[in-house]
């Protein structure tokens, strides 16, 4: 049966046993800035092109054991959530991956900046259709990272990022705090904000909307046919990147403002239990859970 | 995220170092009264001191970025400091990434075309 997260973002009209938009997102290229990925995984094989871009810090610790499957874990799962054959949102979208996070999931602001610059240069050299950039990472507030995101957004690129897993105000983190970026918090199957131990999804006025981010089934780098469930605002952001890819594929001329407006318009409203958020953040945090447009757009979205 | 709001700095630390009249013999001194600012991550454990993104003013050309980077290296060398230019930015933001001692920040902030300097910091998978 359909995984809960795909059911949650699918309009009632399409809730059959399977989530099968045949060609969702085929006009769109999604760039993923994350860990290395297992590109020969059955879920994403032929859908993800691994670029030669790599800018990562050394791993921490004197006795760190580098295992390919662990190095690829985070990125492989997210690529699967965006465009995986069986468990992906935008099954028609093509992806390009840049490695900016090391085997321990750690990167740098400077490495991320150079990655964003690489995307801009690629866009200038070979203009294609609409571009979505997925940034499933967060650090402290960074003026320069936010500025780079702003410039890329003004060049017509849609940037989607994780709100952060710190149970804190997303405005204190980057790129989550960049106004031009679509910032995504995480909710669970009960439409509750996701708790991750003592921590959990970030919140506040820098979050644009929420999306499924707990127990999300996706490609596991343990083997080429393995699946695993992962949780976090990265998974939530991957859902929105997939939805954005489908919307842009249906309407390639959408501006960032129009796309943001559509994402909000088609979201489920007031379903999140706001009691989880600190009192002073409740009114500032959007009560929106991302969803695909309903059947009135059938000809556009499910061609 | 969330458009239509003023930029949020949060606990972001900003250190403003005023430019002085002494310009170290530079041909292109910055406009009178401007200040370049230094920024670093508010979360100390995520800071990466020793690597800095020097962001230049918006209309700065690549050749000017390269010249500014070389000038920083020359001035640092005169003071006995080694520096390494790791990357020159162009396409999104003009500027360069430099590995250097924090002792050189005051000097770097006085270079022509400099808008602000940010210390590198960590980001994490979410």
């Amino acid at each position: 049966s359909i995984p809960w997260n795909l059911e949650r973002i699918t309009p009632p009209r399409y809730r059959a046993d399977e989530y099968q938009p045949p060609d969702g997102g085929s006009l769109v290229e999604v760039y993923l800035l994350d860990t290395s990925i297992q590109s020969d995984h059955r879920e994403i094989e032929g859908r993800v092109m691994v670029t030669d871009f790599e800018n990562v810090p050394e791993e921490d610790g004197t006795r760190f054991h580098r295992q390919a499957s662990k190095c690829d874990s985070h990125g492989t799962h997210l690529a699967g959530v965006v465009s995986g054959r069986d468990a992906g949102v935008a099954k028609g979208a093509s992806m390009r991956s840049l490695r900016v996070l090391n085997c321990q999931g750690k990167g740098t602001v400077s490495g991320t900046l150079i990655g964003l610059e690489f995307i801009r240069k690629s866009q200038l050299v070979q203009p294609v259709g609409p571009l979505v950039v997925l940034l499933p990472l967060a650090g402290g507030y960074s003026r320069v990272l936010n500025a780079a995101c702003q410039r890329l957004a003004r060049a017509g690129v849609v940037l989607v990022t994780a709100a952060g897993n710190f149970r804190d105000d997303a405005c204190l983190y980057s790129p989550a705090s960049a106004p031009e970026v679509i910032t995504v918090g995480a909710t669970n199957a009960q439409d509750q904000p996701v708790t991750l131990g003592t921590l959990g999804t970030n919140f506040g006025r820098c979050v644009d909307l929420f999306a499924p981010g707990e127990d999300i089934i996706g490609a596991s780098s343990d083997c080429s046919t393995c699946f695993v469930s992962q949780s976090g605002t990265s998974q939530a952001a991957a859902h929105v990147a997939g939805i954005a890819a489908m919307m842009l594929s249906a309407e390639p001329e959408l501006t960032l403002a129009e796309l943001r407006q559509r994402l909000i318009h088609f979201s489920a409203k007031d379903v999140i239990n706001e009691a989880w958020f600190p009192e002073d953040q409740r009114v500032l945090t959007p009560n929106l859970v991302a969803a695909l447009p309903p059947s009135t757009h059938e000809n556009l979205y499910f061609q | 995220g969330a458009m239509g709001q003023e930029d949020e700095d949060g606990d972001y630390e900003e250190l403003v170092l005023a430019l002085r009249s002494e310009e170290d013999g530079l041909a292109e001194a910055p406009e009178h009264g401007t200040t370049a600012t230094f920024h670093r991550c508010a979360k100390d454990p995520w800071r990466l001191p020793g690597t800095y993104v020097v962001v230049l003013k918006e209309e700065t050309h690549l050749s000017q970025s390269e010249r500014t980077a070389r000038r920083l290296q020359a001035q640092a060398a005169r003071r006995g400091y080694l520096t390494k230019i790791l990357h020159v930015f162009h396409g999104l933001l003009p500027g360069f990434l430099v590995k250097m001692s924090g002792d050189l920040l005051e000097l770097a902030l006085k270079l022509p075309h400099v808008d602000y300097i940010e210390e590198d910091s960590s980001v994490f998978a979410q």
Epitope: R63, F64, H65, K106, L196, G197, T198 | K43, D44, R47
Partner: antibody, heavy 122, light 110 residues
């Protein structure tokens, strides 16, 4: 609910070995780093060891380095501490504790077990 | 020998405020996140504060944390008899590549 239960403590002679276990329940064990912390009778807390969520990195206090080994079996939701060449000064209550997060292991510990007592005596 | 120094005891009357200091160095408190733990008599420690000043859910706002340079402080306002316990600061030490706890402070309610 979230729970950590230590076992394997007991009385052991100096120079001998002991293996402690910590059974985790109520949370996704494989998503969190795990620590061992000990407390000698009437003394303060002393950190012993840390293992990352995927087992890829291990850290030890100088006082136990080379004698103790931390490990985990994510399929069994269990954390272990293999203690060799035990000394009288290793006598303590041993707690397992969950790291606040996988990547930000230096944040501290948010869930603690009730502890198991190890007595090293001849 | 702990690298984080705390006062052995602090005491105050019910309803009063107490502060506990934790002094370290640049390799620990100066550049790493500080947590505070409460250990009631005969029980396991419990997390009170993490990331210098954040409280886990269920911890009352009578407990607060702050950091300045290489020192951290735990504040307890509206002191109650149930607050009688040992309190420990803790942080990562980059030089030691390990976690370190403070020497511990016993809080007594007069």
């Amino acid at each position: 609910q979230v729970q950590l239960v230590e076992s394997g403590g007991g009385v052991v002679q100096p120079g001998r070995s002991l293996r402690l276990s910590c059974a985790a329940s109520g949370f996704t064990f494989s998503s969190f780093g795990m620590h061992w912390v000990r407390q000698a009778p009437g003394k303060g807390l002393e950190w012993v060891a840390l293992i990352w969520n995927d087992g890829s990195n291990k850290y030890y206090a100088d006082s136990v380095k080379g004698r103790f080994t931390i490990s985990r079996d994510n399929s069994k939701n269990t954390l272990y501490l293999q203690m060799n060449s035990l000394r009288a000064e290793d006598t303590a209550v041993y707690y397992c504790a969950r790291a606040i997060a996988a990547l930000y292991y230096y944040y501290g510990m948010d869930v603690w077990g009730q502890g198991t007592t190890v007595t090293v005596s001849s | 020998q702990s690298v984080l120094t705390q006062p052995p005891t602090v005491s105050a009357a019910p309803g009063q405020k107490v502060t506990i200091s934790c002094s370290g160095s640049s390799s620990n408190i100066g550049n790493n996140f500080v947590s505070w733990y409460q250990q009631l008599p005969g029980t396991a420690p419990k997390l009170l504060i993490y990331d210098y000043n954040k409280r886990p859910s269920g911890i009352p706002d009578r407990f607060s944390g702050s950091k300045s340079g290489t020192s951290a402080t735990l504040g307890i306002t509206g002191l109650q008899t149930g607050d009688e316990a040992d309190y420990y600061c803790g942080t990562w030490d980059s030089s030691l590549s390990g976690y370190v706890f403070g020497t511990g402070t016993r809080v007594t309610v007069l």
